[in-house]
């Protein structure tokens, strides 16, 4: 039956009295502007909302903006504009809320022309109280926390200083000129460009890349002829210009910049970008722009050194540089991604890996539902989802996929099923097996959010319309209920839910649409009466994660293990609770050739899992560049996916020589590489 | 400056249709209801019309109800009244009004007259 | 509909003069009431609305009070600019209604 229409969905009982005992309206003093709004700290219930009305005047425009607090997850809120002097905030700097449980908060003024510095207001007290402070600079960026020690912070200044802060704003001090882009590293680092000539703009692929570990008292150059870095997980990357012309590489250090070595990934040329989709402390996923304005490239997956490189999926979709990819971590299952392709027509395409990037296929068809006009045949098809392309494409996807770490295996997403993604209006799609199987959730496209890990979800119709109704299942989306939350339709602008899904509040924020004038709106919505007793132990199944054939005795195995996890029955109403941790039980899986990626020089054919030779690679002897080194590759094909854990069964031969001679990669090496202090 | 400039105000025959503009300026014209108000050759006041901050919502007299439709183009800033099946007892100098958060005439326009005569 | 009874049509008065408009609702209408000014040949301007609060920029000689179905709006010390038409509206309930209008001219 289709989704909702059930017998079994009666379950939830006198749930409009519950509900209503728990909606909390707060109509807020403001015209509509726009609204921003951070959550301080874990569990804390604290947020933060700024609300900023632009006046357009005929010379200039006039700024005013509110700030709000609550601590109450959203039920209630104070004004607490005075605290901060009255002062308008740029909306374009946000709320720079502190790493962790710090409770810091610094918002940036906007400050008349002429002032010879730009202005914050700091609270370490998550926002009861704030400290204004005049800066000596006027700040480019957001003011970045250091992520190990929240009283250090850094800024740009729109004189390309770089000015960082150990007392938590209070006192700044300018360690360095001429800075294009600056990132705090492991350990308080600081990484940073520098240009030597004109600007940023004009030294592109000449810059200098820094390194400061002690907050700007010394500084060691780590790269010359730079044209952008990047951190992701352990590795430090850098593309670099090449001496003789105008293409670029990608070279990786694992030791903050002490050492490098050249990643073994193509060139790109001036209008071709490379992109770090994702990484972690044990490999990384990088796009590789094809030559030409064709909108797409190709995916590798890099070893645990961040160096060899294995091709794992053609023609990617990614626009332009800065543009957009559906590229998307699902988050709720190890070793899941989900990404679009383009094809020879044009089309986009869905596709998803369950093993990191090993292999790529189809999203398999929802048993619920038909294929649609863009299938040439009725009966085959497959989801395609709809992510960043498709909102940035203007289609009707109010959002892009979802899944949370602590609601095991649920996957929300708008898409389509046939041969492509299509452009008509989308449905709701949910998978409770991390992307495996998927069901039609809901119909045509809707706001959502998880609760509970995953003991609710709630949604809300994307609609041009002021609207009054939202929709919950305590089922993972098989049926819905719906609650008129308000009388009065609003025009609905967000759904927002604590960071983490661990809450049972929700925040459904609008204006008014009124007779006399639109004013921001919020109703907050506390499930906790729904789900009236806390889960027990008989509330929980057994679940084998990645199981596709029960019979098989490596089933369930991925990155050389299998998980069960302990998740919770569909038709059990109950609360996990914002103490919830995930109950899983890791097993050593024996080694087969799904554990081994194809090493350099190597690729898989389609459907199938051995690696065989790159053509053009035949019969060469494989060298490459190590920290300056010259290395020779002996190797059958294949190397262990980085992360990946099974022992014994297949065992492929990889032997990596130091050939003792020197190479070059266009980079300082470590022995020419220069310190100054401060 | 708060602003609104009414246009499109005509001689028309009794049966004919016309449609009125207000160009709105100086203020965010989505966050405000507006309104129609006529004032006829004796001087006296007629709400006509008005229309909520996103125009889902309208409301008219019974007068006018089923003949006027009032509607808004917020990203041009232009509040408009489309008149039909018109009368000689329409009329009247037409003004826009623009709402605040308290009521609804807290800004007139100058006004643009209509005359329905054969 | 609500009949809103303004009173009086007309009345000649001297600058410096204290005056009273009144306006009678044929209901209660729980202070949804505004008050107009429409200068000679120009359009109108909200003075008063919810039978008390003065709009931003309107002189504090103005003032209105009233409850219940009876409302006032008093002009002290009366200023050259201040000979004009002025009209209440009430809003309390669709359609909105006005009164007749007072014509305030110089004695």
């Known amino acids: 039956s289709a989704p909702g229409e059930d017998e079994e969905c009666g379950r939830v009982r006198d749930f409009v009295a519950k509900l209503a005992n728990n909606t909390h309206q707060h109509v807020f003093d403001d015209l509509r502007g726009s609204v921003s709004l951070s959550w301080v700290g874990d569990s804390t219930g604290v947020i933060l909302v700024l609300t900023t009305f632009h006046v357009p005047l005929v010379i200039m425009t006039f700024g005013q903006s509110k700030l709000y607090r609550s601590e109450d997850y959203g039920k209630n809120f104070k004004d607490i504009t005075d605290l901060i002097n009255n002062t308008f905030i740029r909306t374009e700097f946000g709320m720079a809320i502190g790493p962790e449980n710090s409770g810091k908060v610094v918002l940036t003024a906007e400050v008349s022309g002429g002032s010879r510095g730009g202005r914050i207001f700091r609270s370490s007290d998550f926002a009861k109280n704030f400290v204004q402070t005049d800066l000596p600079f006027h700040p480019l960026t957001q003011m970045m926390y250091s992520p190990q020690n929240s009283d250090y912070l850094l800024a740009l200044s729109t004189e390309n200083g770089l000015w960082v802060s150990k007392n938590f704003g209070g006192k700044w001090e300018e360690i360095h000129k001429a800075v294009c882009l600056a990132k705090w590293g492991s350990d308080n680092t600081i990484f940073f460009t520098t240009y030597a000539n004109g600007s940023c703009k004009a030294d592109l692929g000449a810059l200098e890349l820094w390194r400061t570990s002690d907050l700007g008292k010394s500084f060691k150059t780590i790269g010359v002829k730079i044209y952008s870095f990047g951190l992701g997980g352990r590795f430090l990357f850098a593309s670099v210009m090449a001496d003789k012309d105008t293409t670029r590489r990608i070279h990786v250090s694992t030791d903050q910049g002490d050492t490098w070595s050249m990643a073994q990934l193509p060139s790109v040329g001036q209008e071709q970008f490379y992109s770090i989709l994702a990484a972690n402390d044990d490999m990384v996923f990088m796009h590789v722009d094809e030559p030409g304005d064709t909108g797409f490239g190709t995916i590798f997956t890099s070893d645990d050194r961040g160096i060899v490189y294995s091709k794992s999926l053609d023609r990617h979709l990614y626009t332009t540089t800065g543009g957009e990819t559906d590229f998307t971590n699902v988050t709720s299952l190890r070793g899941v991604y989900i990404t679009s392709v383009l094809s020879e027509d044009n089309s986009i395409q869905t596709m998803i890996t369950f093993d990191q990037g090993g292999r790529w296929t189809h999203l398999r068809k929802p048993e619920n539902s038909e294929c649609d006009a863009t299938a040439k045949n009725k009966n085959e098809c497959s989801l395609h989802i709809h992510a960043s392309y498709s909102i940035s494409q203007k289609l009707n996807v109010p959002m892009a996929p979802l899944s949370e770490p602590n609601a095991v295996g649920i996957v929300i997403a708008h898409g389509s099923v046939g041969d492509a993604i299509s452009v008509m209006v989308p449905d709701v799609y949910i998978s409770d097996d991390g992307g495996y199987s998927w069901t039609k959730m809901l119909e045509g496209p809707h706001y959502y959010t998880i609760l509970d890990s995953g003991g609710i979800i709630v949604a809300i119709e994307h609609s041009s319309r002021p609207i009054n109704v939202i929709k919950f299942s305590t089922d993972e989306g098989q049926c819905w209920q719906t609650y008129t939350f308000t009388r009065d339709p609003i025009y609905f602008t967000g759904l927002a839910s604590e960071p983490g899904a661990r809450s049972m509040n929700i925040s459904i924020w609008g204006f008014t649409e009124s007779f006399l004038t639109s004013q921001w709106v919020s109703y907050t919505i506390d499930f906790k009466d729904i789900l009236e007793r806390n889960c027990e132990e008989k509330d929980y199944t057994i679940w084998l994660a990645h199981s596709t054939d029960p019979e098989d005795y490596e089933d369930g195995c991925i990155l050389g293990y299998k998980e069960q996890f302990l998740r919770l029955r569909k038709s059990s109403v109950c609360q996990n609770g914002r103490d919830y941790v995930v109950t899983k039980q890791p097993s050593i899986c024996l080694c087969s050739l799904e554990d081994f990626l194809c090493d350099f020089g190597y690729y898989r054919p389609e459907n199938d899992s051995k690696c065989v030779e790159q053509p053009e690679l035949k019969g060469h002897d494989l060298e490459f560049c190590l920290y300056g080194r010259e290395e020779h590759l002996t190797t059958n094909g294949y190397r262990k996916i980085p992360g990946d854990k099974c022992q014994g069964g297949v065992n492929p031969v990889r032997e990596v020589k130091d050939l003792k001679k020197k190479c070059t990669s266009n980079f300082l090496s470590p022995e020419k590489q220069n310190s100054k202090s401060n | 400056e708060v602003q609104l400039v009414e246009s499109g105000g005509d001689l028309v025959k009794p049966g004919g249709s016309l449609k009125l503009s207000c160009a709105a300026s100086g203020f965010t014209f989505n966050t405000h209801g507006m309104s129609w108000v006529r004032q006829t050759p004796d001087k006296s006041l007629e709400w006509v019309a008005t229309?909520?901050?996103?125009?889902?919502?309208?409301s008219y007299p019974d007068s006018v109800k089923g003949r006027f439709t009032i509607s808004r183009d917020n990203a041009k800033n232009t509040l408009f009244l489309q008149m039909s099946s018109l009368k000689s007892e329409d009329t009247a100098m037409y003004y826009c009004?623009?709402?605040?958060?308290?009521?609804?005439?807290?800004?007139w326009g100058t006004g643009t007259t209509v005359t329905v005569s054969s | 509909d609500i009949l809103m009874t303004q009173s009086p049509s007309s009345m000649s008065v001297s600058l410096g003069d204290t005056v009273s408009i009144t306006c009678h609702a044929s209901?209660?209408?729980?202070?949804?009431i505004g008050w107009l000014q429409q200068k000679p040949g120009k359009s109108f301007k909200g003075l008063i609305y919810?039978?008390?609060n003065l709009e931003d920029g309107v002189p504090s000689r103005f003032s209105g009070s009233g409850s219940g179905a009876d409302y006032s709006l008093t002009i002290s010390s009366l200023e050259y600019e201040d000979f004009a038409d002025y009209y209440c509206v009430q809003y309390a309930h669709f359609p909105y209604t006005f009164g007749g209008g007072t014509k305030l001219e110089i004695k």
């Open positions: 229309i909520s901050t996103g125009g889902f919502y309208t």
């Open positions: 009004a623009k709402s605040s958060s308290h009521w609804y005439f807290d800004v």
């Open positions: 209901q209660g209408i729980s202070s949804n």
């Open positions: 919810h039978g008390t």
